[in-house]
Amino acid sequence: ESALITQQDLAPQQRAAPQQKRSSPSEGLCPPGHHISEDGRDCISCKYGQDYSTHWNDLLFCLRCTRCDSGEVELSPCTTTRNTVCQCEEGTFREEDSPEMCRKCRTGCPRGMVKVGDCTPWSDIECVHKESGTKHSGEVPAVEETVTSSPGTPASPCSLSG
């Protein structure tokens, strides 16, 4: 990860509150779970469940924890060193080209196609042509056969960590 951090995703934390742990930076950097003070003398702990940092850093603020959207389930909570891990609910998936929202999986394949892959949190059902075996592009068909698929079981999480 590049050490150059610009201002996106910064948490509302300035100087350390009395309960926050402090330690000294090592060669100008603070360990994961901390950020640096303005005078560069202290490492200040991130607030559990509110913000985090994953690497050694000289950030002025810890990074804001992601909040899972409606339609997502939280696989693991935000800690001081790791962002929240969110995943699409059963029956929905997140595409690489539209990662901002979970989309409903199709319930079946178009005519002349057969299902070869289940709905997962990161992919729609997969359909191939019965004859050629080539994949379907993914557009929702005008007419669907009554071939239905049950949602796949979640395997690996779709992490939204920064």
Partner: antibody, heavy 116, light 110 residues
């Protein structure tokens, strides 16, 4: 005594560039976050940018993002602001300040005028 | 338009007290420390109050700061002619990820 002295201001045409410098003395410069804050004539204060002690973490105001670049040379105790694609609305007195979320010491400023 | 809202001006007679309000939101004042600055015309801003209510060394106790919810207040007692200046509040805004200021308040000693 903490001292911050800005230089490099002047008159520049729209679309032009300027590089501001801030010479710091009276404190250990290298660990401190440093900032640039500007003030248009007769207007209030507007934060521009901030940089960590090592230069590894940098923050910009939306109004200057992609046009201005903050940097520092700790061996020279100097803070810089490279300003490109300057606009009339960038006309202001530019202050160098120690700190970022609540700067405690400020220089006297250097005037930047963008006009054709 | 400034993110933080201050009254444009306040005035009082010498020896009196003035208060300057600074209103924001949960993303700035509500979750962060507030600083106050004094700027005499033609000079650089000077830190008066930091961490909501702390005074740097050399700042007289006539100046005080407080914060409640999403608003902050600067108080000046025993007003003197030398207090005539513009006063700015400032804090970090976590939504904008930027240091934000109020529009400034001009204090006039009558």
């Amino acid at each position: 005594e903490v001292q911050l002295v800005e230089t490099g201001g002047g008159l520049v045409q729209p679309g032009g560039s300027l590089r501001l410098s801030c010479a710091a003395s009276g404190f250990t410069f290298s660990p401190y976050y440093m900032s640039w804050v500007r003030q248009a004539p007769g207007k209030g204060l507007e934060w521009v940018s901030a940089i960590s002690g090592s230069g590894g973490s940098i923050y910009y105001a939306d109004s200057v993002k992609g046009r201005f670049t903050i940097s520092r040379d700790n061996s020279k105790n100097t803070l810089y602001l490279q300003m490109n694609s300057l606009r009339a609305e960038d006309t202001a007195l530019y202050y160098c300040a120690r700190g970022a979320s609540g700067p405690d010491y400020w220089g006297r400023g250097t005037m930047v005028t963008v006009s054709s | 338009q400034s993110v933080l809202t201050q009254p444009p001006s306040v005035s009082a007679a010498p020896g009196q007290k003035v208060t300057i309000s600074c209103s924001g939101s949960t993303s700035n004042i509500g979750n962060n420390y507030v600083s106050w600055y004094q700027q005499v015309p033609g000079t650089a801003p000077k830190l008066l109050i930091y961490d909501n209510n702390k005074r740097p060394s050399g700042i007289p106790d006539r100046f005080s700061g407080s914060k409640s919810g999403t608003s902050a207040t600067l108080g000046i007692t025993g007003l003197q002619t030398g207090d005539e200046a513009d006063y700015y509040c400032g804090t970090w805004d976590s939504s904008l990820s930027a240091l934000v200021f109020g529009g400034g308040t001009k204090v006039t000693v009558l």
